[in-house]
Amino acid sequence: EQAPGTAPCSRGSSWSADLDKCMDCASCRARPHSDFCAGCAAAPPAPFRL
């Protein structure tokens, strides 16, 4: 759970209770067991800017 009163994470990131901050969902490729990765599965990635 994200701490009460904190701003939601931006697209492409998810709240980490372990690290007490928003973390990049992209890092779940290398570290899929990170606590925040469960929150990434439901959230769409940040859009590519080509």
């Epitope: 690290l19 990049d24 992209a26 890092s27 490729r29 290398a30 570290r31 990635p45 940040a46 800017r49």
Partner: antibody, heavy 119, light 111 residues
Framework: EVKLQQSGGGLVQPGGSMKLSCVAS????????MNWVRQSPEQGLEWIAE??????????HYAESVKGRFTISRDDSKNSVYLQMNNLRPEDTGIYYC??????????WGQGTTLTVSS | DTVLTQSPASLVVSLGQRATISCRAS??????????IHWYQQKPGQPPKFLIK???NRDSGVPARFSGSGSGTDFTLNIHPVEEDDTAIYYC?????????FGAGTKLELQ
């Protein structure tokens, strides 16, 4: 404020040894992969070693150029990472940086320490 | 190993103009969702400073003048408008695999 404070370095003869240290503060050290990156005019920025987490028994990875000669280690109780360098060669000369990454990018770097391998 | 080729090696730009730096990977470093390319700025006597992650996402505190784009094998760092403080060497780095490698750097100078 995140800080990576390095120590060690200096002049060493070919075949000699040197140990570098890096003490971290301002972030949850035990969750981060710790790395050493060196820089020289010849090789540019060159990643040389990484140590991961206790939960995986501290796996390590090395660049081919240093494999078998360099050893990376960490002490989470001291928020510290080390690089033991043996059988040093002139081509190991450069600026050595410790750097942390959660998984992908090196978001914080030490100030750098210079190693010169010369007779 | 994935090789990153940066171009140009050096670049001279007038104040207020656009600087464009290219980074080409020897293989794709993108999934369908993310690109595993990151950008750094280094000034003389200092360590590299992290600027942009996953091809296009600025680190906190990095001015909007810096932007990154690209996917697959071709990536670009744009700086516009260029300011005096931007004189530095810029490096790309991939995190697709071990070893993570860096480009050779692009030196940006002001005219």
């Amino acid at each position: 404020e995140v800080k990576l404070q390095q120590s060690g370095g200096g002049l060493v003869q070919p075949g000699g040894s040197m140990k570098l240290s890096c003490v971290a503060s301002g972030f949850t050290f035990s969750y981060y992969w710790m790395n050493w990156v060196r820089q020289s005019p010849e090789q540019g920025l060159e990643w040389i070693a990484e140590i991961r987490l206790q939960s995986n028994d501290y796996p390590t990875h090395y660049a081919e150029s240093v494999k078998g000669r360099f050893t990376i280690s960490r002490d989470d109780s001291k928020n510290s990472v080390y690089l033991q360098m043996n059988n040093l060669r002139p081509e190991d000369t450069g600026i050595y940086y410790c750097a942390c990454r959660y998984a992908d990018y090196f978001d914080h770097w030490g100030q750098g320490t210079t190693l010169t391998v010369s007779s | 190993d994935t090789v990153l080729t940066q171009s140009p090696a050096s670049l001279v730009v007038s104040l207020g103009q656009r600087a464009t730096i290219s980074c080409r990977a020897s293989q794709s470093v993108s999934t369908s969702d993310y690109s595993y390319i990151h950008w750094y700025q280094q000034k003389p006597g200092q360590p590299p400073k992290f600027l942009i992650k996953y091809a296009s996402n600025r680190d906190s505190g990095v001015p909007a003048r810096f932007s990154g784009s690209g996917s697959g094998t071709d990536f670009t760092l744009n700086i516009h408008p260029v300011e005096e403080d931007d004189t530095a060497i810029y490096y790309c780095q991939h995190s697709w695999e071990i070893p993570p490698t860096f480009g050779a750097g692009t030196k940006l100078e002001l005219q």
